[in-house]
C-alpha cells in the first residue's frame, strides 16, 4: 500500500518534500514515477537511477529516499501530484498529494 500526506502546504519561494511511502513484505520497488498533474516531474529506476524532467531540473532534487524536494515554489505549483510505484511482483500502486502554495507572509 501507499501511505502519504494527502494535503500539504508551503510558502511561495520556499521548498517542500513530496513523499510517498510504500510498504510491502514481499514486493520490491523497481521504479517510481512522479507527475505534476499529467506532466512528468521525475523518474526513479533501480536500473537507471534518477531522471528529472528538464523543465524542472533547476528546482527539483531527488530525495529524501524515493521522494522529491521541490524548491523555489511559485503559486503555479499549487495542484495535484502523483507518485506511481512499480513493484515486483506486487504490481503498480499510486498515491496522490495536493500541494497548496501560499503567499509568503
Amino acid at each position: 500500500t501507499i501511505d502519504t500526506k494527502r494535503n500539504i502546504s508551503a510558502e511561495e519561494g520556499g521548498s517542500v518534500i513530496l513523499q510517498c511511502h510504500f510498504s510491502s513484505d514481499t514486493a520490491e520497488v523497481t521504479q517510481v514515477d512522479w507527475k505534476q498533474q499529467d506532466q512528468l516531474l521525475a523518474i526513479y529506476s533501480v536500473d537507471l537511477g534518477w531522471h528529472v524532467a528538464s523543465v524542472f531540473s533547476d528546482r527539483v532534487v531527488p530525495g529524501p529516499s524515493l521522494g522529491l524536494t521541490f524548491q523555489s515554489l511559485t503559486m503555479n505549483d499549487t495542484g495535484e501530484y502523483f507518485c506511481t510505484y512499480h513493484t515486483y511482483p506486487g504490481g503498480i500502486y499510486k498515491g496522490r498529494i495536493f500541494l497548496k502554495v501560499q503567499e509568503s507572509s
Epitope: V46, D47, G49, W50, H51, V52
Partner: antibody
Framework: EVQLVESGGGVVQPGRSLRLSCAAS????????MHWVRQAPGKGLEWVAV????????LYADSVKGRFTISRDNSKNTLYLQMNSLRAEDTALYYC????????????WGQGTMVTVSS | DIQLTQSPSSVSASVGDRVTITCRAS??????LAWYQQKPGKAPKLLIY???SLQSGVPSRFSGSGSGTDFTLTISSLQPEDFATYYC?????????FGGGTKVEIK
C-alpha cells in the same frame, strides 16, 4: 555467447536521416534495458538514449532529444536508433550496449557503427 | 547534468608500476560509479561497477574505491595489456555521463 552487432552507419549529408540497428543474441533481449552510446573521433564517450525492456519508456540526451528515436522489436531481438535532422556534431561511432541488471553499468557492447555527417 | 572530472588526463608508467586514476563528480552520486577500459579501435570494457565491485573476468589487480564525489581506480601492478584509456561513468542521474578519459601510456 552474448553478442551485439550494430549496422546501418554511413556517410550522410546534414539534415538527412539514418537508421541504425543492433542485433542481439545470446541473452533474453526482452528482459533488458538497452542503451545507445556514441564516441566522436578522438573524443570520449557520450550516452545517447535508453529504452525500457518492453519499450514503454524512452529517455534521451538533450543533444539528440527531438531528433533521435530509440525503439526495439523484441520479437526480432533488435534495437534501433532513428536519427533525423543530422548535424556535423553527430559524427561518431555509435555503440549499442546492454547493462548488468541493477548495476547501472554496461557490460556488453557492440563493435560500433560509424556515422559521418558531412556535405 | 553531472560532470565527471578525471585526473590525470594521461600518465606514463612502466610494467609493474602502481597506477592510480581519480574521478571527481560535480555532485554526490553515492556509489553509482563504473570504470571502463578502452583500447584503440575497440569497444569499452567494463572493469568496475558500484564504485568497487569487480566485473566478472577482470583481473584482481584492478580495484575501485570511493563514494559521494571522489573515486579512484587503482591498477596494483601494471601489465603490458593494461596500456589503454580509462573512463569513469556515473549512474546516479540520467543522463549517464562519462569522464573525459585517462590515457595510460608506456614510459
Amino acid at each position: 555467447e552474448v553478442q551485439l552487432v550494430e549496422s546501418g552507419g554511413g556517410v550522410v549529408q546534414p539534415g538527412r536521416s539514418l537508421r541504425l540497428s543492433c542485433a542481439a543474441s545470446g541473452f533474453t533481449f526482452g528482459s533488458y534495458y538497452m542503451h545507445w552510446v556514441r564516441q566522436a573521433p578522438g573524443k570520449g564517450l557520450e550516452w545517447v538514449a535508453v529504452i525500457w525492456p518492453d519499450g514503454s519508456n524512452k529517455l534521451y540526451a538533450d543533444s539528440v532529444k527531438g531528433r533521435f528515436t530509440i525503439s526495439r522489436d523484441n520479437s526480432k531481438n533488435t534495437l534501433y536508433l532513428q536519427m533525423n535532422s543530422l548535424r556535423a556534431e553527430d559524427t561518431a561511432l555509435y555503440y549499442c550496449a546492454k547493462p548488468v541488471p541493477k548495476s547501472r553499468a554496461l557490460d556488453v557492447w557492440g563493435q560500433g557503427t560509424m556515422v559521418t555527417v558531412s556535405s | 547534468d553531472i560532470q565527471l572530472t578525471q585526473s590525470p588526463s594521461s600518465v606514463s608508467a612502466s610494467v609493474g608500476d602502481r597506477v592510480t586514476i581519480t574521478c571527481r563528480a560535480s555532485q554526490g552520486i553515492s556509489s553509482w560509479l563504473a570504470w571502463y577500459q578502452q583500447k584503440p579501435g575497440k569497444a569499452p570494457k567494463l572493469l568496475i561497477y558500484g564504485a568497487s565491485s569487480l566485473q566478472s573476468g577482470v583481473p584482481s589487480r584492478f580495484s575501485g574505491s570511493g563514494s559521494g564525489t571522489d573515486f579512484t581506480l587503482t591498477i596494483s601492478s601494471l601489465q603490458p595489456e593494461d596500456f589503454a584509456t580509462y573512463y569513469c561513468q556515473q549512474a546516479f542521474y540520467l543522463p549517464w555521463t562519462f569522464g573525459g578519459g585517462t590515457k595510460v601510456e608506456i614510459k
